[in-house]
């Protein structure tokens, strides 16, 4: 037999909270348990579902869970079935609703001295108790002509008068909780003695020193009083005006006039109406002083023909909002066409060259007018005034290449030389009109030049070839003083270039002819064997047809080139001893000897007491020290040539003689002993 160990029992439950109907079964064989609600099987949902044999409620619902629940156990093999006792919920709930007018049928029918009944649509179980409120203040039964019927949850006002006007709300509470009305009811019962607004003052914006008018009217029986106040609560009357409102007038109809308005008059004005009964009505209006700021500057604009462009005019800050319009040549632009105004924008469609000029954006309000010009340039493609021409420029002189163009705006001109952009430096200058100046033309300037002139609208370019007209010049100029070695072969070269290949010849400066052993071979003067008589002044003459001739004077000296008779040798000296470095040279003219030690020339006038250079060229260093060690160079020179020879000087400590060495043992290196 199937036995219920735990049976479901009826119980209190709270709307929306958890609950559990218990059911436990004992049976000899397997049974399956299910639940019935009012005789119908219960389907599992997320809210309500079987938990073992029991039925669990995640959130009790007063509508879906009202009725009788029964636990059923069934043995599917034998068909035996057992049912538990019935169980139900006593569900406690409360639900908000609106305050509604029950009597009369519509608000339009509410008149002073009629009965008005309001109903509070808050429901619940157990039945809640109700509390009524007017303008947030609790109302108690039997007070001030009203009756509260808790059972009927009604509020009755009999008779209803102006004093009952206000916002009615209700709240209810029960064992379950509390709820307040979801929508409240405004009761408005006119009282002739209460002040009512007929005309409310409006905010005004006025220009400085203009006048401002505020209108204000109230009605009531008997007629209400009216008073004006300025921000600081100072009353304004025709008899007593505050110092900053001297020019204020209050008219019989309640209007307030302010003349010659100044910044200190700006602010909030309050118009207060008071009836015989009821609260004062306060109306506010603000007086603003009109203002307009300056407009930002426009950048000049460059547009290209055929394009469509827009220029936005940002209106200046102002009160009231300034109106904006565009003008060109003193005429206001239309709102459609090819050049027109759209909103705050100037629109130029399919721009033509004739559209260039000054356009003005105007902005105006009560405070005044502002304007700002924008300069519109319509860019044109440059056109030629003078193209660069193939030119012959003279070497060494300034050369000019023109690239004269005209356009709007002024064009940018750049020059290329052999496809390389030219920068301005000491040799090249580009003038703003496009002309290229080569300050001192050189042979290698003979090449292609190209100039490009451009504006935002387009560019043009042209090129020209420069041919350099070479100067008649020596290349290189001969040295004005040269030496030849006596009794040897010698050559003196002379070469020149010019527009035409020049002829070159040598002659003696005195006009005498060259001896037969001296030949002039295409500009090279050749001496087979130099004699003393070959010394003297010679002239190299280069000439060609178009450029005439040029001369270079050369003084030739015949010399016996320098040779050393005595050369300094590698020398080692004991510290404190004297070193002698010998050097003797011969030649014609007689050579002079100089010494260089430790990479500096030894000046005979500044040698000091330890060093001396003899007439024959030898160098003596007394009392040598380790720092005197190093390389010493003997330099022999005359007006024709120079020769040098060098040797090292070593300064060593004197060794202590050993017993084994005899008194005459030689040192292991060449030594000067003094």
């Amino acid at each position: 037999a199937i036995v219920f160990i735990k049976q479901p029992s009826s119980q209190d439950a709270l709307q929306g909270r958890r609950a559990l109907l218990r059911c436990e079964v004992e049976a000899p064989g397997p049974v399956h348990v299910y639940w019935l609600l009012d005789g119908a099987p219960v389907q599992d949902t997320e809210r309500r579902f079987a938990q073992g044999s029991s039925l669990s409620f995640a959130a009790v619902d007063r509508l879906q869970d009202s009725g009788t629940f029964q636990c059923v156990a069934r043995d599917d093999v034998t068909g035996e079935e057992a049912r538990s006792a019935n169980a139900s919920f006593n569900i406690k709930w409360i639900e908000a609703g609106p305050v509604v007018l029950k009597h009369p049928a519509s608000e339009a029918e509410i008149q002073p001295q009629t009965q008005v009944t309001l109903r509070c649509h808050i429901d619940g179980h157990p039945r809640p108790t109700y509390q009524w409120f007017r303008d947030g203040t609790p109302l108690s039964d039997g007070q001030s002509n009203h009756t509260v019927s808790s059972k009927e949850r009604n509020l009755t006002l009999r008779p209803a008068g102006p004093e009952h006007s206000g916002l009615y709300s209700c709240c209810a509470h029960s064992a379950f909780g509390q709820a307040c009305s979801s929508q409240n009811f405004t009761l408005s019962i006119a009282d002739e003695s209460f002040a009512r607004v007929v005309l409310a003052p409006q905010d005004v914006v006025v220009a400085r020193y203009e006048e401002a008018m505020f209108h204000c009217q109230f009605s009531a029986q008997p007629p209400p009083s009216l008073q004006w106040l300025f921000e600081d609560e100072t009353p304004i009357t025709n008899r007593s005006r505050p110092p900053h409102l001297r020019r204020a007038t209050v008219f019989a109809n309640g209007s307030l006039l302010l003349t010659q308005v100044r910044p200190r008059n700006a602010g909030i004005y309050r118009c207060i109406g008071q009836g015989q009964r009821g609260p004062p009505i306060i109306l506010e209006a603000t007086l603003h002083l009109a203002e307009i700021e300056d407009m930002p500057l426009f950048e000049p604009r460059v547009f290209t023909a055929g394009s469509e462009e827009r220029v936005t005019c940002l209106p200046p800050k102002g009160l009231p909002e300034p109106s904006v319009w565009w003008e060109h040549a003193g005429v206001r632009l239309p709102t459609h066409g090819r050049v027109y105004q759209k909103g705050h924008e100037l629109v130029l469609a399919n721009i033509a060259e004739s559209d260039a000029g000054v356009y003005t954006c105007h902005a105006a309000n009560l405070a005044g007018q502002r304007r700002q010009d924008v300069n519109i340039t319509v860019a044109t493609v440059p056109s030629w005034l003078k193209k660069p021409q193939d030119s012959q420029l003279e070497e060494g002189k300034p050369g000019y290449l023109d690239c004269l163009t005209q356009a709007t705006p002024k064009p940018t001109v750049v020059w290329y030389r052999n496809q390389m952009l030219i920068s301005e430096d000491s040799r090249f200058e580009v003038f703003k009109n496009g002309t290229l100046r080569i300050n001192s033309v050189e042979v290698y300037d003979g090449t292609w030049y190209r100039c490009m002139s451009s504006t935002p609208a387009g560019s043009i370019e042209a090129q020209a070839r420069v041919q350099v007209l070479e100067k008649l010049k020596f290349t290189p100029p001969p040295q004005p003083q040269q030496c030849m070695e006596f009794d040897k072969e010698a050559t003196v070269p002379c070469s020149a270039t010019g527009r035409e290949k020049p002829t070159i010849k040598w002659e003696r400066a005195d006009g005498s002819s060259l001896p037969e052993w001296v030949t002039d071979n295409a500009g090279t003067l050749h001496f087979a064997r130099v004699t003393r008589d070959d010394a003297g002044n010679y002239t190299c003459i280069a000439s060609n047809g178009p450029q005439g001739q040029i001369r270079a004077h050369v003084q030739l000296t015949v010399a016996v080139f320098i040779t050393f008779k005595v050369e300094p040798e590698r020398t080692t000296v004991y510290q404190g001893h004297t070193a002698l470095l010998q050097c003797e040279a011969q030649g014609d003219p007689k050579p002079l000897i100089q010494w260089k030690g430790k990479d500096r020339i030894l000046d005979p006038t500044k040698l000091g007491p330890r060093m001396h250079i003899f007439q024959n060229g030898s160098l003596v260093i007394h009392d040598v020290a380790p720092e005197d060690s190093g390389r010493y160079t003997c330099i022999a020179g005359n007006s024709c040539n120079i020769k040098h020879t060098e040797a090292p000087l070593y300064v060593v400590d004197k060794p202590v003689p050993e017993e084994s060495e005899g008194p005459g043992s030689p040192p292991p290196y060449k030594m000067i002993q003094t």
């Epitope: 940018t412 001109v413 750049v414 030219i422 920068s423 301005e424 580009v430 003038f431 703003k432 560019s459």
Partner: antibody, heavy 118, light 111 residues
Framework: QVQLQQSGAELVKPGASVKLSCTAS????????IHWVKLRTEQGLEWIGR????????KYAPKFQGKATITADTSSNTAYLQLSSLTSEDTAVYYC???????????WGQGTLVTVSA | DIVLTQSPASLAVSLGQRATISCRAS??????????MNWFQQKPGQPPKLLIY???NQGSGVPARFSGSGSGTDFRLNIHPMEEDDTAMYFC?????????FGGGTKLEIK
């Protein structure tokens, strides 16, 4: 050789104006554009504007419109920069520079220090 | 206006190494095959000196270790090898359209 010689340092009071000069030697200013550039240590270099001394046409950076006026006197081969309503923000070194129709500055003046101080 | 953004604001490079300064324009500075971007060097108490004009062309008397590259909106100044004398402020400048504008500058120092 090409040189732009600028006038000496200026110490001026706030609200005052100052006029700087830039005299060219070894070239005619009519053949070139003369530009003015402002240097402040923190802000770096700022282009003020330029003049075509031949016809007096000027172009300015928007920031310096109303603040700077560039003029030129071709007879003395000199360009000028006038700065008005001076404030501490105008304390800077001002350079003039030469440009041809190829738009780059190859030659500059040595600069003029303007100090605005009460 | 064309805005030039230079980076980095400061840079320290060892002697003999490469220094690279970048300059980005808010719009292209190219026109008719030329990039109108120039680079200047400025040392204290001296006016700026034109190093590179038209993006990649060396100014007069500028050592070969200074080179410029780039087109459109992105440009670079390279210095290699870095020398003691290169310590200075470096500015990029566009001359495509008025108003001509400069970058904020890069301070180059020896590491």
């Amino acid at each position: 050789q090409v040189q732009l010689q600028q006038s000496g340092a200026e110490l001026v009071k706030p609200g005052a104006s100052v006029k700087l000069s830039c005299t060219a030697s070894d070239f005619n200013i009519k053949d070139f554009y003369i530009h003015w550039v402002k240097l402040r240590t923190e802000q770096g270099l700022e282009w003020i504007g330029r003049i075509d001394p031949e016809d007096g046409e000027t172009k300015y950076a928007p920031k310096f419109q109303g603040k700077a006026t560039i003029t030129a006197d071709t007879s003395s081969n000199t360009a000028y920069l006038q700065l008005s309503s001076l404030t501490s923000e105008d304390t800077a070194v001002y350079y003039c520079a030469r440009a041809s129709s190829g738009p780059w500055f190859a030659y500059w003046g040595q600069g003029t220090l303007v100090t605005v101080s009460a | 206006d064309i805005v030039l953004t230079q980076s980095p604001a400061s840079l320290a490079v060892s002697l003999g190494q490469r220094a690279t300064i970048s300059c980005r324009a808010s719009e292209s500075v190219d026109n008719y095959g030329i990039s109108f971007m120039n680079w200047f060097q400025q040392k204290p108490g001296q006016p700026p000196k034109l190093l590179i004009y038209a993006a990649s062309n060396q100014g007069s008397g500028v050592p070969a270790r200074f080179s410029g590259s780039g087109s459109g909106t992105d440009f670079r100044l390279n210095i290699h090898p870095m020398e003691e004398d290169d310590t200075a402020m470096y500015f990029c400048q566009q001359s495509k359209e008025i108003p001509w504008t400069f970058g904020g500058g890069t301070k180059l120092e020896i590491k």
